[in-house]
Each structure stands twice: as structure tokens, then as C-alpha cells.
């Protein structure tokens, strides 16, 4: 969490941002909130990016003002116009690119004063794994598959019964480049699995950690998958 203040005493306002991550090819949110004002027409929001000459986005007098927007953000940005009045200056970024990573500044002017806060935005690719029983194999195996990751993640298997066991000798992981030549499909196979056990396939890079669990018993099969972004720190 980054909390920024304006420069001059009583003319400063609090602006708060949250470091976040964007999934390339999808839409992302750059979070920013501020002390709200009564009149929308008195609020100015400017989003800037370090190293970029033009503005990322500007909103003033109740509408977008994009005459000074940098070309790299043309047609890809929007604020939540109906939420600006309650202090939400978050920016929606369409079709996130690897090059969108960097330091952004959320700069706010209201009738109460000015304020700004920086935000670190990471970009990459992350997806939830599917873990399935592979009955085609000679011995019972599990196959963990996740369609899009970047940068290349690590893959680790774990088991509820054999806690702390190292499965690297009985697993095989491969990374296959996807058609857009950036992200990769992750496939990991675990051999010699036993029944009445829960296995977890954990995929992690510096942006996200995803886990796929599977529990196989005589009477049921239970699957779970979840994902956590690793760098959601507020400023």
C-alpha cells in the first residue's frame, strides 16, 4: 500500500495505491483511491508512467481528456467514471502488454488540494492448473496442466500423506511455447501415485502462485485449484 500526500500542509490530500499484476492479453486494474470531493467537476485524475512522455490517462471536469495521452495507451484505458465522485481513481487497462510493466503515478487534484502515490505494476502470464488422473499411463499418474505462464515458473509437487517428500525424481515437467511466442503452457506429470491421498501441483513465478489439488479415493475424486497474486502491496 502506498499512501501519498500533497506537498503543502492543509492543501494536501491522501492518495492510496495498491501494487498489482497484469495478465498479458487480458484486462487489468491499476488501483488508486483518494479523499473524495463533493463536486465531480472539481476532480482531476492524471495517470503517468515513469519513462513515458505522454499521459497514461487524464480525467477532468467529469470526462476523459485524452489529448495528451501517449500513443502506447491509445484506446486501452478508462476510469470508472461513476465511482470517481466517491474517491475511486482506479484505471482499467485493456489488453495488458509485457511493456506495460513499470512505475505509475496516480496524481489527484480536488478542491481540497493535491496528492499523488506511486504504484508498481508487474506484467506476466498466470493461469490456474487442472490436475487430472491419467489412466492411459502404465502406472497411475497425475497430469497437471496450466495453459499460460510467463516468466517461466517453477513446478513442485506435494502430498498430504508424504509431507516434505521430494517428488522431483518421480515427476516430469515441460514448458511449451504458445502460439504468440511469449507465454508457455506448463505440463507436469507425477508418477506412481497412491489412492486415498491428496496431491498438490504448485506453479509459481515472481507474479503469481497457483495450486491444483486432487484427492482420489475409492468412491470419489475431488479437484480444487486456486491462484494468488504475490505482489499486491498497498502504498
Amino acid at each position: 500500500l502506498i499512501i501519498g500526500f500533497g506537498i503543502s500542509g492543509r492543501h494536501s490530500i491522501t492518495v492510496t495505491t495498491v501494487a498489482s499484476a497484469g495478465n498479458i492479453g487480458e484486462d487489468g486494474i491499476l488501483s488508486c483511491t483518494f479523499e473524495p470531493d463533493i463536486k465531480l467537476s472539481d476532480i482531476v485524475i492524471q495517470w503517468l508512467k515513469e519513462g513515458v512522455l505522454g499521459l497514461v490517462h487524464e480525467f477532468k471536469e467529469g470526462k476523459d481528456e485524452l489529448s495528451e495521452q501517449d500513443e502506447m495507451f491509445r484506446g486501452r484505458t478508462a476510469v470508472f467514471a461513476d465511482q470517481v465522485i466517491v474517491g475511486n481513481a482506479s484505471l482499467r487497462l485493456k489488453n495488458v502488454q509485457l511493456t506495460d510493466a513499470g512505475t505509475y503515478k496516480c496524481y489527484i487534484i480536488t478542491s481540497k488540494g493535491k496528492g499523488n502515490a506511486n504504484l508498481e505494476y508487474k506484467t506476466g502470464a498466470f493461469s490456474m492448473p487442472e490436475v487430472n488422473v491419467d489412466y492411459n499411463a502404465s502406472s497411475e499418474t497425475l497430469r497437471c496442466e496450466a495453459p499460460r505462464w510467463f516468466p517461466q515458473p517453477t513446478v513442485v509437487w506435494a502430498s498430504q500423506v508424504d509431507q516434505g517428500a521430494n517428488f522431483s525424481e518421480v515427476s516430469n515437467t515441460s514448458f511449451e511455447l504458445n502460439s504468440e511466442n511469449v507465454t508457455m503452457k506448463v505440463v507436469s506429470v507425477l508418477y506412481n501415485v497412491t489412492i486415498n491421498n491428496t496431491y498438490s501441483c504448485m506453479i509459481e513465478n515472481d507474479i503469481a502462485k497457483a495450486t491444483g489439488d486432487i484427492k482420489v479415493t475409492e468412491s470419489e475424486i475431488k479437484r480444487r485449484s486456486h491462484l494468488q497474486l504475490l505482489n499486491s502491496k498497498a502504498s
Epitope: 496442466e145 470419489e220 485449484s225 494468488q228
Partner: antibody, heavy 130, light 107 residues
């Protein structure tokens, strides 16, 4: 969104094998995150899950039918199939093919996948009778 | 297998009524429950997944709640097109099972 269409004989003799095919359009059967399912509904009754298959070939079956069921996938034809052998009159039902899909939901710690049967075929009636 | 019990099996209601259908699971299933609507001669249609998440395109008069073993589907103001049979389904583990259904009829 994918569309599904069931096909196969509407009448099967007792003790024979019921064979149905589901053709997938507006999407690839090789897409990750989808499980290709069969569900049936006996006349005037509720729904019964038969089983499903992932594009890689992993299958999951209802234990009550497991000994008689085979679900297979043909990625080249964008189709998946159901075979149910040794049929009796009790297998008379409307058979639906459907997609079981992982839908990500926001949780306090990130995201969690919730599976749900979100797209269904129109259904095909199969009668078992001599 | 996880058994799902729906109540009531039949329900007579009028347009504008608030309708509540309950689904009980034989064991805890967290929020792994979906609700479907089925009209005669048609395939079921997904209304709600993850117990309370409204499927895209489904009217906001439909809502779901519950966790663990007890779940409810509520229609806040019944419309003519809502007269149908409603099913709950757990997605906690395989085999998936459905509730027996609740038929909502015009009073």
C-alpha cells in the same frame, strides 16, 4: 461460447450398446479448462451425471454406471462420444452432452476455480426397446 | 456419493411472489453448488454457480446463498417466464449429483 449437438440412434435394443456422439462447434475440444460431459434425464425424472472427459483423455465416471460406460474424445473431429453397453429399459432417457467449465471466482486470498456445467446440448431421446 | 435434497418438490406461486427453494447436502460442500432452470422439452440453463455467483445474462431477481450443507435459491419477484423446474447440483467432487428438482407452477 461453444455449442453442442448430440447425434445417434433414437432406438436401441436391450442388451446392445448405446452409442452417442457430441459435436462441438464455435470452440476447440482441445481447450484447457473444459470437461466434456454426458448427463441423462429419465422420463419425468431428475438429472443424472454419467461422466466426463478432459481433452487429454482423463475420464471420470459415475460409479453406478462405471462398469458399462466409455467416454472418448476425437480432437481431430472436435467430437466426444458416449458408449453404454448392456442397456435395459432403465436406460431410456434424454441424453445431454454438456461442458463442465472452470470459472474463476475472486476470494479473499486470490482466485478459486468453481466448476459448473454451463453449456448444454439440446438433448437426444434414446429409447431402449425390442 | 453426496446426496442433495430439495424442498419443496412442488411450489404454486403467483407472478410477483417471492419464491425460495432450499437444497440440503448430505455432507459439507463449501460453496460448490450450482442452480439450474429447466423448462419442458429444453436443456437445463445455468443460473448460479459457486452458491451465490449469478451467471452472466441471468436476471438479478435470481439470487443464491448458503455454504456447507444448506443452500437457497431465491426469486425476488416471480415473472411469467420463471415457471419451470429448478435443480441444485453439487460440484464438490465426482460423482456430481443433482437434487430431485422443484417444480414452480402458476397458482
Amino acid at each position: 461460447q461453444v455449442q453442442l449437438q448430440e447425434s445417434g440412434p433414437g432406438l436401441v435394443k436391450p442388451s446392445q450398446t448405446l452409442s452417442l456422439t457430441c459435436t462441438v462447434s464455435d470452440g476447440s475440444i482441445s481447450s484447457g479448462g473444459y470437461y466434456w460431459s454426458w448427463i441423462r434425464q429419465h422420463p419425468g425424472k431428475g438429472l443424472e451425471w454419467i461422466g466426463n472427459i478432459y481433452y487429454s483423455g482423463s475420464t471420470y465416471y459415475n460409479p453406478s454406471l462405471k462398469s458399462r460406460v466409455t467416454i472418448s474424445v476425437d480432437t481431430s473431429k472436435n467430437q466426444f462420444s458416449l458408449k453404454l453397453n448392456s442397456v435395459t429399459a432403465a436406460d431410456t432417457a434424454v441424453y445431454y452432452c454438456a461442458t463442465e467449465k472452470a470459472l474463476a471466482t475472486v476470494t479473499p486470498s486470490g482466485y478459486e476455480n468453481y466448476y459448473t456445467v454451463d453449456v448444454w446440448g439440446q438433448g437426444t431421446t434414446v429409447t431402449v426397446s425390442s | 456419493d453426496i446426496q442433495l435434497t430439495q424442498s419443496p418438490s412442488f411450489l404454486s406461486a403467483s407472478v410477483g411472489d417471492r419464491v425460495t427453494i432450499t437444497c440440503w447436502a448430505s455432507q459439507g460442500i463449501s460453496s460448490y453448488l450450482a442452480w439450474y432452470q429447466q423448462k419442458p422439452g429444453k436443456a437445463p440453463k445455468l443460473l448460479i454457480y459457486a452458491a451465490s455467483t449469478l451467471q452472466s445474462g441471468v436476471p438479478s431477481r435470481f439470487s443464491g446463498s448458503g455454504s456447507g450443507t444448506e443452500f437457497t435459491l431465491t426469486i425476488s419477484s416471480l415473472q411469467p417466464e420463471d415457471f419451470a423446474t429448478y435443480y441444485c447440483q453439487h460440484l464438490n467432487s465426482y460423482p456430481l449429483t443433482f437434487g430431485g428438482g422443484t417444480k414452480v407452477e402458476i397458482k
